[in-house]
């Protein structure tokens, strides 16, 4: 009886089970009653990452420097090339098809998480007791200066954008 289902790593064609081609190889011809499936290795800059019956290998992804991309991991006959972004840039999507400049955190905001090749900078507002007076992709919110530890007093209160201003204690008191 002709099979209706095949084992793992096989496929059904012309009422018989043929072996799939292994990763890194493409299908040249289906098996017959006399021959096994004929497969050929993918060429340079091509890949197939699964057991397959594809007649063409996929082209490796091109990491276009004009889009701010660079190769993170070179592709093989079984894996695609992995792109990442140049320093200071990050991917616009999970597929990393283009890059954008890391955002900076404005004054009053500090860096909660520094950007990576795949994620943008995450900013957070400086809470009471902290400030940031620069626009930066790296700087966290800094704590206000503690005047007391310097034996000084607060002359000007701090904000989320400015540090406190300390001054000498009033000696007349």
């Amino acid at each position: 009886e002709p099979p209706t289902a095949c084992r793992e790593k096989q496929y059904l064609i012309n009422s018989q089970c043929c072996s799939l081609c292994q990763p890194g190889q493409k299908l040249v011809s289906d098996c017959t009653e006399f021959t096994e499936t004929e497969c050929l290795p993918c060429g340079e800059s091509e890949f197939l990452d699964t057991w397959n019956r594809e007649t063409h290998c996929h082209q490796h992804k091109y990491c276009d420097p004009n889009l701010g991309l660079r190769v993170q991991q070179k592709g093989t006959s079984e894996t695609d090339t992995i792109c990442t972004c140049e320093e200071g840039w990050h991917c616009t999507s999970e597929a990393c098809e283009s890059c954008v400049l890391h955002r900076s955190c404005s004054p009053g905001f500090g860096v909660k998480q520094i950007a990576t090749g795949v994620s943008d900078t995450i900013c957070e507002p400086c809470p009471v007791g902290f400030f940031s007076n620069v626009s930066s992709a790296f700087e966290k919110c800094h704590p206000w200066t503690s005047c007391e530890t310097k034996d000084l007093v607060v002359q000007q209160a701090g904000t989320n954008k400015t540090d406190v201003v300390c001054g000498p204690q009033d000696r007349l008191r």
């Epitope: 040249v28 009653e33 006399f34 021959t35 004929e38």
Partner: antibody, heavy 117, light 107 residues
């Protein structure tokens, strides 16, 4: 018991034609691909032709393509090999074989073909 | 076409000894190789399929190994009934091809 019995061989002159037969028994003939393989006096084996179980697909090496025709009659459990424009290098013992698991799992006893002037 | 080269062409052996017969393919054929035995005045018979799979009814002293381009048929403790010619055959692609054979003879 699987049995393959070839017939039709003989002595012929170059350029002549010949039709070989193979009578199969002991298995469901229509479920199996079949092949012809020949063996010359040096004992070398050479594949000559194959035919799918249903008879729709036939396969030949380049050196016999156009001169040999493999066919089958499933109702009669019989395999054939028609050879034309025979050459001296076609002289050999011709075996009928069954394809099981992509191997030639059963062989007949062979029929002798001699092409000579 | 895939060329199969068998070596040695002839192998002289004393019964009880073990032997290894080689079959080399001109390109990778994965494990798509069969081994056949032909005794004197008999038809060939299938010994091993898919390079290493044993065939029902074939004595366990016969074993096959290899993949890609290099294959070996091993006969452990040769018996007198084992003398004859051994052929390898590839079924990786058309045309089907056989090796030239290795003749196993009595030393």
């Amino acid at each position: 018991e699987v049995k393959l019995v070839e017939s039709g061989g003989g002595l012929v002159k170059p350029g002549a034609s010949l039709k070989l037969s193979c009578a199969a028994s002991g298995f469901t003939f229509s479920n199996y691909g079949m092949s012809w393989v020949r063996q010359n006096s040096d004992k070398r084996l050479e594949w000559v032709a194959s035919i799918s179980s249903g008879g729709d697909d036939t396969y030949y090496p380049d050196n016999v393509k156009g001169r040999c025709t493999i066919s089958r009659e499933n109702a009669k459990n019989t395999l054939y090999l028609e050879m034309s424009s025979l050459k001296t290098e076609d002289t050999a013992l011709y075996y009928c074989t069954r394809a099981g698991g992509k191997a030639m799992d059963y062989w007949g006893q062979g029929t002798s073909v001699t092409v000579s002037t | 076409d895939i060329v199969l080269t068998q070596s040695p062409a002839t192998l002289s052996v004393i019964p009880g000894n073990s032997v290894s017969l080689s079959c080399r393919a001109s390109q990778s054929i994965r494990d798509n190789l069969h081994w056949y035995q032909q005794k004197s005045h008999e038809s060939p018979r299938l010994l091993i399929n898919y390079a290493s799979q044993s065939i029902s009814g074939i004595p366990s002293r016969f074993s096959g190994s290899g993949s890609g381009t290099d294959f070996t048929l091993t006969i452990n403790s040769v018996e007198t009934e084992d003398f004859g010619i051994y052929f390898c055959q590839q079924f990786n692609s058309w045309p089907l091809t056989f090796g030239g054979g290795t003749k196993l003879e009595l030393k």
